[in-house]
């Protein structure tokens, strides 16, 4: 596929981590600067649902 | 089950290409970025490139930058890393690896969650 | 682009010890930092994430902390199996940088 080129480095101006307005299964990345699939967010401490933060769950699946 | 795959690798003269490919699977690459990550021998982890596939955003490191060129084709559901003008600081270890986000009030919090096995890239002549 | 200084380059302790690995980012990267562990011929896995998050199917001897441009690793009790390489990564700036590593060898 053709690619366009995200010069990333020459836009660190601090409003480059403002995230944008995403869809509900995505969230802002400000690495690559964009929207990208999102899964739900999990308190550390207990692996419950926090009543602080909207969108959190469980810990996510196990990695290889 | 997620899984990312290498192949591509082997020895190459100075100057020479190659282009490595990451078959992935258990997820679908349009939905995250795909990282490019080298060790040379005795080293510690490099940042080679990553992409974008839903936008075709790409970033490299300087190290890289006008030599390699990373892509990916959402149809294969792989990633590709081509490599080109070889020099002997190049040998490494090439690993892919999913960029993972979770929801954090709307922001990505998230790591590199699952990588491949790592391909051998050795520049030589 | 942002550094990220890792220390101790390497350590040696045993089992049961208390491990604290610092990383230290030359700007604000707020709580974008992820740690890893890495053993000789396998690919790295995935510890801690947004600076203190533990990722899942992770020892919770394993912690995180920090915020800025000062972050911390523990083990809070050293097991045979921690022997490792670990690394620290930004991502909240483009491009991701790891710190050098930090081995952890037995005393």
């Known amino acids: 596929m053709g690619a366009r080129r995200l010069r990333v480095r020459s836009q660190r101006s601090r409003d480059s981590s403002v995230p944008t307005q995403c869809n509900q299964t995505e969230c802002f990345d400000p690495l690559v600067r964009n929207c990208v699939s999102c899964e739900l967010f999990h308190t550390p401490d207990t692996g419950h649902t926090s009543s602080l933060e909207p969108g959190t769950a469980l810990q996510p699946q196990e990695g290889s | 089950e997620v899984q990312l795959v290498e192949s591509g690798g082997g020895l190459v003269q100075p100057g020479g290409s190659l282009r490595l490919s990451c078959a992935a699977s258990?997820?679908?690459?349009?939905?995250?970025?795909i990282h490019w990550v080298r060790q040379a021998p005795g080293k510690g982890l490099e940042w080679v490139a990553w992409?974008?596939?839903?936008?075709?955003?790409?970033d490299y490191a300087d190290s890289v930058k006008g030599r390699f060129t990373i892509s990916a084709d959402t149809s294969k559901n792989t990633a590709y890393l081509q490599m080109n003008s070889l020099r002997a600081e190049d040998t490494a270890v090439y690993y892919c690896?999913?960029?993972?986000?979770?929801?954090?009030?709307?922001?990505?919090?998230?790591?590199?969650?699952?990588w491949g096995q790592g391909t051998l890239v050795t520049v030589s002549s | 682009d942002i550094q990220m200084t890792q220390s101790p380059s390497s350590l040696s302790a045993s089992v049961g010890d208390r491990v604290t690995i610092t990383c230290r980012a030359s700007?604000?990267?707020?709580?974008?930092v992820a740690w890893y562990q890495q053993k000789p011929g396998k690919a790295p896995k995935l510890l801690i994430y947004?600076?203190?998050f533990l990722y899942s199917g992770v020892p919770s001897r394993f912690s995180g902390s920090g915020s800025g441009t000062d972050f911390t690793l523990t083990i809070s009790s050293l097991q045979p199996e921690d022997f490792a390489t670990y690394y620290c990564?930004?991502?909240?700036?483009?491009?991701?940088?790891f710190g050098q590593g930090t081995k952890v060898e037995i005393k």
């Open positions: 690896a999913r960029r993972v986000c979770y929801n954090r009030l709307g922001v990505c919090a998230g790591g590199m969650d699952y």
């Open positions: 258990g997820f679908t690459i349009s939905s995250s970025s």
């Open positions: 992409v974008l596939p839903s936008v075709g955003f790409t």
């Open positions: 700007e604000d990267i707020s709580t974008a």
């Open positions: 947004a600076a203190s």
């Open positions: 990564q930004q991502s909240q700036i483009s491009p991701p940088t």
